[in-house]
């Protein structure tokens, strides 16, 4: 058993049928010695008396808010949550496996640049009685500071019969140098509580590996005289690290017909312009990627050919 | 990347061209190592990230772009020098700061070259003959060092009398390649910045 926060405790249980559970001793936070009784949640049934209460915690029915009273007055509370260990592996019931980029990916994180700011998000099908708290650091043995905001519900989607909820959080490394070579990964830890179930999820990454630039901005077409060709030009996104000559991007320019089946023409360039043939009803799209470290491509920025 | 990209005229800034070749070569070598050593801990998540140049060179700090010298987090490790206008060409006057940056890059390359050559000698003794260093990568390191055109004492190749532990050697190779790839990215950024200056 360990304390998650004031008056909230997590009991770790080896979870299997007929498991013996864990013996827990609760102590009433009071100078009083006599006349103390204990109840669980809203029930008025007295579970025991005295300054301490010993309970055997086996199932969720044994978890909840234990309260000690004296003469009708509440003295203190202890909320017991359960953390299930199933065959040596902590349960992952609360969050959905996003399966990207690999199986057992519960937290996904992205950064738009090398400033030390990043966003993480996760999915769940649970809509109520759900709380998250996020902590982060650079390295784990001698952790350096990363400040995270509160997790917020960022999207709701309908997936078949189920509703899916996306939560996200923004974090900022306290002292980040965009040019630094990372040797210690960022660690992100999410505590999730659903009703009386506690779970924790972690992700470890280097900012360089989660970079995904914003799409190029100001995408424009300039027709070339007496030709089907057009000059496509664009600019680095505002959110990208500067100076651009140091933090360079490379670009992929794509000409795509109306039908998804039509052949796509693609050109790769380090410049911020390219000459392509514009077909009728086609659209031109450009995306960006760090020129020197191949992390994710940005989303496409698009303009119609017409 | 799927398609090759046109590089600037090498005569204009030869170091840029060589640094791009270096990054390509080390990335290919790392990919090959990860595939060949699939039963060894060779991924970024599994290895310890060690920097053999730590406390010996200061490439990141010495080559910091002028724009980032205002960022206190980039200056916290030492009195940092930063690069100003200049190029890799001997015919142009390079500033003291830039010379410091380029000599730091040269020292990095020299240290990695010695490590890789020592490691290759060990890998050649492996009866499994599982993996060797790409000669192209070693050649590209050499070419960039020549283009940087610094003279420094030659570091003797380390020789070891004890029987090599091939498992440890292969893990060390992965660690070295990961670190060298990161340094090659920094070198490429620096050369690109200098080229634009």
């Amino acid at each position: 058993i360990w304390e998650l926060k004031k008056d909230v405790y997590v009991v770790e249980l080896d979870w299997y049928p007929d498991a013996p559970g864990e013996m827990v001793v609760l102590t009433c936070d009071t100078p009083e010695e006599d006349g103390i009784t204990w109840t669980l949640d809203q029930s008025s049934e007295v579970l025991g008396s005295g300054k301490t209460l010993t309970i055997q915690v086996k199932e969720f029915g044994d978890a909840g808010q234990y309260t000690c009273h004296k003469g009708g007055e509440v003295l203190s509370h202890s909320l017991l949550l359960l953390h299930k260990k199933e065959d040596g592996i902590w349960s992952t019931d609360i969050l959905k496996d996003q399966k990207e980029p690999k199986n057992k990916t519960f937290l996904r994180c992205e950064a738009k640049n090398y400033s030390g700011r990043f966003t993480c998000w996760w999915l769940t099908t649970i809509s109520t009685d759900l709380t998250f708290s996020v902590k982060s650091s650079r390295g784990s043995s001698d952790p350096q500071g990363v400040t995270c905001g509160a997790a917020t519900l960022s999207a709701e989607r309908v997936r078949g019969d189920n509703k899916e909820y996306e939560y996200s959080v923004e974090c900022q490394e306290d002292s980040a140098c965009p040019a630094a070579e990372e040797s210690l990964p960022i660690e992100v830890m999410v505590d999730a509580v659903h009703k009386l179930k506690y779970e924790n999820y972690t992700s470890s990454f280097f900012i360089r590996d989660i970079i995904k630039p914003d799409p190029p901005k100001n995408l424009q077409l300039k027709p070339l005289k007496n030709s089907r060709q057009v000059e496509v030009s664009w600019e680095y996104p505002d959110t990208w690290s500067t100076p651009h000559s140091y933090f360079s991007l490379t670009f992929c320019v794509q000409v795509q017909g109306k039908s998804k089946r039509e052949k796509k023409d693609r050109v790769f360039t380090d410049k911020t312009s390219a000459t392509v043939i514009c077909r009728k009803n086609a659209s031109i799209s450009v995306r960006a990627q760090d020129r020197y470290y191949s992390s994710s491509w940005s989303e496409w920025a698009s303009v119609p050919c017409s | 990347r799927n398609l090759p990209v046109a590089t600037p005229d090498p005569g204009m800034f030869p170091c840029l061209h060589h640094s791009q070749n270096l990054l390509r070569a080390v990335s290919n070598m790392l990919q090959k190592a990860r595939q060949t050593l699939e039963f060894y801990p060779c991924t970024s998540e599994e290895i310890d990230h060690e920097d053999i140049t730590k406390d010996k060179t200061s490439t990141v700090e010495a080559c910091l772009p002028l724009e980032l010298t205002k960022n206190e987090s980039c200056l916290n490790s030492r009195e940092t020098s930063f690069i100003t206008n200049g190029s890799c060409l001997a015919s142009r006057k390079t500033s003291f700061m830039m010379a410091l940056c380029l000599s730091s890059i040269y020292e990095d390359l020299k240290m990695y070259q010695v490590e890789f050559k020592t490691m290759n000698a060990k890998l050649l003794m492996d009866p499994k003959r599982q993996i060797f260093l790409d000669q192209n990568m070693l050649a590209v390191i050499d070419e960039l060092m020549q283009a940087l055109n610094f003279n420094s004492e030659t570091v003797p190749q380390k020789s070891s009398l004890e029987e090599p532990d091939f498992y440890k050697t292969k893990i060390k190779l992965c660690i070295l390649l990961h670190a060298f790839r990161i340094r090659a990215v920094t070198i490429d950024r620096v050369m690109s910045y200098l080229n634009a200056s």
Epitope: Y16, D18, A19, K85, D87, G88, I89, D93, N103, K104 | -
Partner: antibody, heavy 115, light 112 residues
Amino acid sequence: QVQLVQSGGGVVQPGRSLRLSCAASGFTFSSYGMHWVRQAPGKGLEWVAFIRYDGSNKYYADSVKGRFTISRDNSKNTLYLQMKSLRAEDTAVYYCKTHGSHDNWGQGTMVTVSS
Amino acid sequence: SYVLTQPPSVSGTPGQRVTISCSGGRSNIGSNYVKWYQQLPGTAPKLLIYGNDQRPSGVPDRFSGSKSGTSASLAITGVQAEDEADYYCQSYDRGTHPALLFGTGTKVTVLG
């Protein structure tokens, strides 16, 4: 004490269907994940499928994906394995099993796929 | 498609020490616990060892488990005639959990 009693095995022709049941008693069935494991005659153990305690997630071996469906009825304390498009290579003793560091197995039920 | 490899058979005379190996990889045994089962002819498997080296109550202490790196082993010190059975190791793969990974199985024969 924990008990898992299996039923539903038998002889079936290739291409036909069969449904196995596993009735649980002696524990809170709705709190635990469950597996199906099979063993072809003279061969080793092969995992078939898993279902979470609340039925929200199901996992299958590649060899049965798209043909077998694991399900549970927590109000009846029963686990099921619906087997469709059966093949000769599905011939085996099928076991249900609880998920956890200490597990409990059913007695096994024989499924024979033969024409 | 067994990822955990066991010797097909091992044998020993009563009182001898018998060991069975179970070889896997970094993503299974290397990062998860190992279990061992005993299966007597015509019966369901019985749990002998969980959590690499833990014995459930009721399992004789002549059975012991251990794990090192990407391999695990089961030792029977002072093998007895009633130990003649098939033995299976089991673990998980970190990418496919909760799918159970079973070993190929080992037939233990008690001679004499």
